[in-house]
Amino acid sequence: LNTTILTPNGNEDTTADFFLTTMPTDSLSVSTLPLPEVQCFVFNVEYMNCTWNSSSEPQPTNLTLHYWYKNSDNDKVQKCSHYLFSEEITSGCQLQKKEIHLYQTFVVQLQDPREPRRQATQMLKLQNLVIPWAPENLTLHKLSESQLELNWNNRFLNHCLEHLVQYRTDWDHSWTEQSVDYRHKFSLPSVDGQKRYTFRVRSRFNPLCGSAQHWSEWSHPIHWGSNTSKENPFLFALEA
């Protein structure tokens, strides 16, 4: 297949290609379907998935993906080497850790190889697309008769993450939540010993190292209170 790879020089698209509606008068008035949007997420800075809705194409099309980094030593155009598939049609690309450079502008180009001028070039800030793994190893310590401290671990640089703790008792209909900064610990100053508490935590790559909007999955819950083990009232480990 002959495909046109456009160079990452800031002028990725130099021809008057296809437009759906109003366009400058010098443009070719050729109407064609736009390519689907590419959405990328960086999972714990271990790998990145860039995906698109392959079913939005009018007929099954193996779209191709190329990428590069703007203004960097990594500005050479790269072909996707690990495609993701949906019903045997390309629907994404997975990049490995060594191919991820968080603080350089990531440029991704989706192209229809049967119609090479049908392409779309997007720019992304990867530091805003990091989703950490869920917090793990939740533990509860009884600091005093009525005070509990919740601790957890993350498989990432702790100072890069903020956290959201949710807790409720068996008597509650909804969760109470509390934001926690990078210190990954939470104290509940007033605990009712007659109630059973459930805690869970999720984390986000924000605000010190990036501005991600997406949270991790919730941790497995941990429980404390009247139904938990009486063997060691001062330390409770994770309960799945």
Partner: nanobody, 126 residues
Framework: QVQLQESGGGLVQAGGSLRLSCAAS????????MGWFRQAPGKEREFVAA???????FYADSVEGRFTFSRDNAKNAVYLQMNSLQPEDTAVYFC????????????????????WGQGTQVTVSS
Amino acid sequence: QVQLQESGGGLVQAGGSLRLSCAASGRTLSRVAMGWFRQAPGKEREFVAADSWGGDTFYADSVEGRFTFSRDNAKNAVYLQMNSLQPEDTAVYFCAGAPASFATTAYSSSNSYSYWGQGTQVTVSS
């Protein structure tokens, strides 16, 4: 359907500044990726700047550090503040929009945009 109208172009001396505006009607810009392009006489249209509706902004190498893209969703408008203008910035400047499902979508390819303004002339004299 979005209608876009640029304004703010004009004649300015090298080293000067201009602020281009792009007003939208017909639809809110709150879920529209926006871009600025320019076309100099006898040259092809080129990417200048773009933003996603989530707030990420991007620039062509030639304008990085001199131009600033901003948007005001309440006024349904986007802006391009152009500082330290040089004669090579002389062109017709177009704003463009593309409906975007994702807050991170920002396009540098002109064929990704479905809505275009008519353009405003910027002339930088030496």
